[in-house]
Interface confidence: low
């Protein structure tokens, strides 16, 4: 905290302005009224402070509004934006995009991914929901700061907006949060046509259903096998090596290279020996002819 | 397939730093999100950041504000700078392709992170 000083009366700042760059820390600290500094907050981000200089006026804005700033100081705030903990951000309430636009643009280049995520949550919450408005500047203006969303958050994204979401933005979405959107997406794109709906739904697939999985490896789409790594595991298990291969088209040799690694791995040591066989590509550690699958949870159930 | 080797582990005090690299075999690395995971004694493989193949970041709540995850596409490597460790940082940490949904069973050594009080 900064020493409490009085001011000396040829120091007294009537406006917010450059010669406060010269003022020492106690010297800010005692003579900038806080009101006044709200109210021209849009001065501050103009003036060179330095970030100790910053950590004062932060203070002084922390005193007069100790409920959470106001969205008209939040606007504001330029490069004082970056001395912002998620704490501090979680007390606003922001509802306008220019202000979202403003602070992600000065928290560029700065590791600010809390802060950032934190503020996105609160726009969210003092907009109502995750309208195309909001997207559209997500996608803009910080690419994959959707996933910095939790899937409860993301629960309020209308499915009319997800056709705004790149591939891009779902980079490091985890499991939770494309379980949230998918839904979300298969409504969207429900009225296009079989190629046109694989190329658009493909993204979210990493929260798709076996039930959904298997419906597509009906409709020729010839799956990547960047794409097919991605599926949830218990959703690519049940798959029989028919299903799996008309999914994969010509991209089903892509299995051997993949062989060692999960999904696949999981989903051939289900597989009969037999039927992996028939691909023709060598895959290995399937169930050996002759053995019987007994399912044991079934017994352990009952039991 | 893409081969990983994390470095950089060690053994450092409570409020220390470390980086730990990851360096990626394999033409497409650049094309690949990737994460760092930790796993501590006893507990599950969990992941603590992320990066998608345009640089955007992702982190778990423990750590936010003290890691940064940050790759060199040239280099064929991804960073995990830690400061301000705690002792609960303690893990052996592992990178991986494909975050957050990751292979079980191409895991490679990691690194082990000690952090004493």
């Known amino acids: 905290d900064v020493e409490r000083t009085t001011c000396p009366p040829e120091k007294e700042v009537h406006e917010i302005d450059e010669s406060l760059i010269f003022y020492k820390k106690r010297e800010l600290e005692a003579c900038v009224d806080a009101a006044l500094l709200a109210a021209q907050m849009d001065r501050v981000d103009a003036i060179p402070f330095t970030y100790e200089q910053l950590d004062v006026l932060k203070h002084k804005l922390d005193e007069l509004y100790p409920q959470g700033y106001p969205e008209s100081v939040i606007r504001h705030l330029g490069h004082l934006f970056l001395k912002m903990s998620p704490e501090d951000i979680r007390k606003w309430n922001v509802t306008s995009l220019e202000t979202l636009k403003a602070l992600l643009k000065v928290s560029k280049g700065h590791e600010m991914s809390a802060q950032v995520a934190t503020l996105i949550d609160r726009v969210v919450v003092g907009r109502g929901q995750l309208d195309k408005d909001t997207v559209d500047t997500l996608t803009a203006f910080c690419p994959g700061c959707l996933c910095s969303l939790s899937p409860e958050r993301l629960s309020s994204v209308p499915p009319s907006v997800i056709g705004a979401v790149r591939p891009q933005d779902l980079d490091t979405c985890g499991p939770r949060q494309l379980d949230v959107l998918y839904p979300k997406a298969r409504l969207a794109f429900q009225n296009m046509s079989g190629s046109e709906y694989f190329v658009k739904i493909r993204p979210f697939l990493g929260g798709a259903p076996t039930e959904d999985v298997k419906a597509l490896s009906q409709q020729n789409v010839s799956m990547d096998l960047a794409t097919f790594m991605k599926l949830r595991r218990e959703a690519v298990l049940p798959l029989t090596v028919a299903e799996v291969q008309k999914l994969l088209g010509p991209h089903v040799e892509g299995l051997k290279v993949e062989e060692q690694h999960s999904p696949v791995r999981d989903w051939i040591l289900k597989q009969r020996q037999d039927d992996l066989d028939t691909l023709g590509l060598g895959l290995q550690g399937g169930i050996p002819n002759g053995y019987l699958i007994l399912d044991l949870s079934v017994r352990e159930a009952l039991s | 397939e893409v081969q990983l080797v994390e470095s950089g582990g060690g053994l450092v005090q409570a409020g220390g730093s470390l980086r730990l690299s990851c360096a990626a075999s394999g033409s497409t690395f650049s094309s690949y999100p990737m994460g760092w995971y930790r796993q501590a004694p006893g507990k599950q493989r969990e992941l603590v950041a992320a990066?998608?193949?345009?640089?955007?970041?992702n982190y778990a709540d423990s750590v936010k504000g003290r890691f940064t995850i940050s790759r060199d596409n040239a280099k064929n490597t991804v960073y995990l700078q830690m400061n301000s460790l705690k002792p609960e940082d303690t893990a052996v940490y592992y990178c991986?392709?494909?975050?957050?949904?990751?292979?079980?069973?191409?895991w490679g050594q990691g690194t082990q992170v000690t952090v004493s009080s």
């Open positions: 991986n392709t494909r975050s957050p949904r990751v292979p079980n069973d191409s």
């Open positions: 990066i998608s193949s345009g640089g955007s970041t």
